[in-house]
Interface confidence: low
C-alpha cells in the first residue's frame, strides 16, 4: 500500500512530521490503525475518521500545535478499541460530542495536554471493559457529578493520576462499575466527599497516594479490596472497619494505621451449613472470648462468630468454618512504631 504523505504497512498508516497539517482525506477507509506523530495538525476536524469501519487504533502524539478536536471525530467507529492522545500541550478544547458510539472501546488515553475539563464520555457506550487513562493534564481541576455515566456497559478502570484535580463532586462516579480508581499525585486534592461514590459500584481498588486527602468517604467503600494511600500525610484516620468489609490489602502512610488491622480477621465467604449449628456457635463464642480474641472493633451486638474466629480447639473440621482472611497491611508497626504507643493494650484486647 502507498500514500503520498503517510507511511503504510499492512493497513497501518503512520503520518508524521511537519508536512502533515491536516488529516489526509484520501486515507483508505479500510485502514486498521492510524498514527499521527510529530505533525502540525492544528485542528482535527469534524468527521475526520468517518467511514473508517475497520479502524482499531488511533494514535495522536507529540503534536505541539494541536489546539482543537471537533465534534464527531471519534464517532461511530465500530471496531475502534484504542485511542491515544498524548503530548499535545496546546490542546485546550475537546468538543463534548467528540466521542460517540464506540462499542468496542477498551482504552482511551489523554495525557500531557492542556485541556481544562475531563472529556465528555457520556455517549461512548462501550460494550467492553474500559480503561480511561487521563493523566498529566495539569489544567484539569474538577471532576463534576456524573462524569463517567455512559462510558461503558461493563466495568471501568479510571486512572486520573498526576492531573491538577482539586475538587471532586458528590456523585462524580455515578453510574459506573468501578474496578479501579487512581487519584494519586493530584497534590492539591484535599477531599473525597461523603457521597462521591453514590450510584457507583466499587471502587475495588482505590489509590489516593501523594494527595492531601484527609478522610475517606463514609459510604461506598463496601467493595474496596485494595487501598493505597502512600505519602498521604493528611489522612490521619480511617473509616471504621465495618465500612471496609471487603478490604484485603492496605498500603498506607503511617504504621499506626496498620494496628487497626492487626487483630481483625474477616470472614470472606459463606460458611458450610454445619457451622450454623447452635452448639457450634456457642462453643466458638466461648472459645474465642475465653482466649481474648474478640475484637473490640466489632459492634456490640455482633458475635465473634460473624466476625471470624479460631477453631483450633474444637472437634469440628475447622477448615469448613474458618473461611477468614487477615488484611495485609504496610508499613508494619515495628519497635520504633509499636501499636501499644498509639492504641494502648485495651483496644488490642
Amino acid at each position: 500500500c502507498h500514500h503520498r504523505i503517510c507511511h503504510c504497512s499492512n493497513r497501518v498508516f503512520l503520518c508524521q512530521e511537519s508536512k502533515v497539517t491536516e488529516i489526509p482525506s484520501d486515507l483508505p477507509r479500510n485502514a486498521i490503525e492510524l498514527r499521527f506523530v510529530l505533525t502540525k495538525l492544528r485542528v482535527i476536524q469534524k468527521g475526520a475518521f468517518s467511514g473508517f469501519g475497520d479502524l482499531e487504533k488511533i494514535e495522536i502524539s507529540q503534536n505541539d500545535v494541536l489546539e482543537v478536536i471537533e465534534a464527531d471525530v471519534f464517532s461511530n467507529l465500530p471496531k475502534l478499541h484504542e485511542i491515544r492522545i498524548e503530548k499535545a500541550n496546546n490542546l485546550l478544547y475537546i468538543n463534548p460530542e467528540a466521542f460517540q458510539n464506540l462499542p468496542n472501546l477498551q482504552y482511551l488515553l489523554i495525557s500531557n495536554t492542556g485541556i481544562k475539563h475531563l472529556p465528555d464520555v457520556h455517549k461512548i457506550h462501550s460494550l467492553q471493559k474500559v480503561l480511561l487513562d487521563i493523566q498529566d493534564n495539569i489544567n484539569i481541576h474538577t471532576i463534576e457529578r456524573n462524569s463517567f455515566v455512559g462510558l461503558s456497559f461493563e466495568s471501568v478502570i479510571l486512572w486520573l493520576n498526576k492531573n491538577g484535580i482539586q475538587e471532586i463532586h458528590n456523585c462524580a462516579f455515578n453510574g459506573t462499575q468501578l474496578d479501579e480508581l487512581n487519584l494519586s499525585d493530584n497534590n492539591n486534592l484535599e477531599e473525597l466527599p461523603n457521597d462521591v461514590f453514590h450510584g457507583a459500584s466499587g471502587p475495588v481498588i482505590l489509590d489516593i497516594s501523594r494527595t492531601r486527602i484527609h478522610s475517606l468517604p463514609s459510604y461506598g467503600l463496601e467493595n474496596l479490596k485494595k487501598l493505597r494511600a502512600r505519602s498521604t500525610y493528611n489522612l490521619k484516620k480511617l473509616p471504621t472497619l465495618e465500612k471496609l468489609v471487603a478490604l484485603m490489602e492496605a498500603s498506607l502512610t503511617y504504621p499506626s494505621h496498620c494496628c487497626a488491622f492487626a487483630n481483625w480477621r474477616r470472614q470472606i465467604s459463606e460458611l458450610h451449613p454445619i457451622c450454623n449449628k447452635s452448639i457450634l456457635r456457642q462453643e466458638v463464642d466461648y472459645m474465642t472470648q475465653a482466649r481474648g480474641q474478640r475484637s473490640s472493633l466489632a459492634e456490640d451486638n455482633e458475635s465473634s462468630y460473624s466476625r471470624g474466629f479460631d477453631m483450633t480447639y474444637t472437634e469440628f473440621d475447622y477448615d469448613l468454618c474458618n473461611e477468614v482472611v487477615d488484611v495485609t497491611c504496610s508499613p508494619k508497626p515495628d519497635a520504633f512504631n509499636p501499636c501499644e504507643d498509639i492504641m494502648g493494650y485495651n483496644i488490642l484486647r
Epitope: 493497513r11 477507509r29 479500510n30 467511514g51 469501519g53 475497520d54 461511530n76 465500530p78 458510539n101 460494550l127
Partner: antibody, heavy 116, light 108 residues
Amino acid sequence: QVQLQQPGAELVKPGASVNLSCKASGYTFTSYWMHWVKQRPGQGREWIGEINPRNGRTNYNEKFKSKATLTVDKSSSTAYMQLSSLTSEDSAVYCCARLSVGFAYWGQGTLVTVSA
Amino acid sequence: QIVLTQSPVIMSASPGEKVTLTCSASSSVSSSYLYWYQQKPGSSSKLWIYSTSNLASGVPARFSGSGSGTSYSLTISSMEAEDAASYFCHQWSSYPPTFGGGTKLEIK
C-alpha cells in the same frame, strides 16, 4: 481472489454440538475480522458474532452468547463456530463473512439440520 | 438493537422501469455503516452498496443509494434482467449489527 469455503451441510441430533468451519484464502487471514451470520427461511439474517484472527478477540450478539463459540486456527487460515445444545430452532444456514468497508465476502453457508 | 424493515417484500419490474427499494431503521443509523447486498439463488451474498451511496466494485452505474437517519433506499434507474435478485440492507452503526428481511426483485 478472496474465497470463504464452507461445507455444504451438517445433520446433527438434538442436544448435540456441531463445529462449523470456514476456510479463508486469497487474502491475509489475520488482517480482517470474520463474522458469522444465521439465516432461516422467512426469518431474515441474524448476526451471531465476530472474531479477530490476529488476537482471538471476539464480540457476540447477546442472543448467541451461550449458543456459539468462535475460534480460529491461524496456521490453516480457518475460522470455526461451535454451536452447542442444538434444538430445532438452530436449524438454519450459517454463513461466515469477511465484512469490511467497501469490501465484503461471504461463504456459501452450511445448512445445519437438527433432527432426531 | 436496531431493527431494519425492508419494503416491499416482493416486487416485479419491467425492463427499463425505475425501481426503488427502501430500508427503514427503528432508530438512527450512521450513513457510513448502511450497506446493501445482492443475493441470487445458489450464490453467496455480494456487497452492492456501501456507506449508503458508494457502489461496490463491479456494480453497474444504474444502481444508486441514498438516505440518512432512519430512512434509506436503493434505486435502479432502469431495470435489467440481470438485476432480478434478492437485496437486503445491513447496518453496523451500532451493535449488534442487524439485517433487513430482504426484498425479492423479479423481472416481469
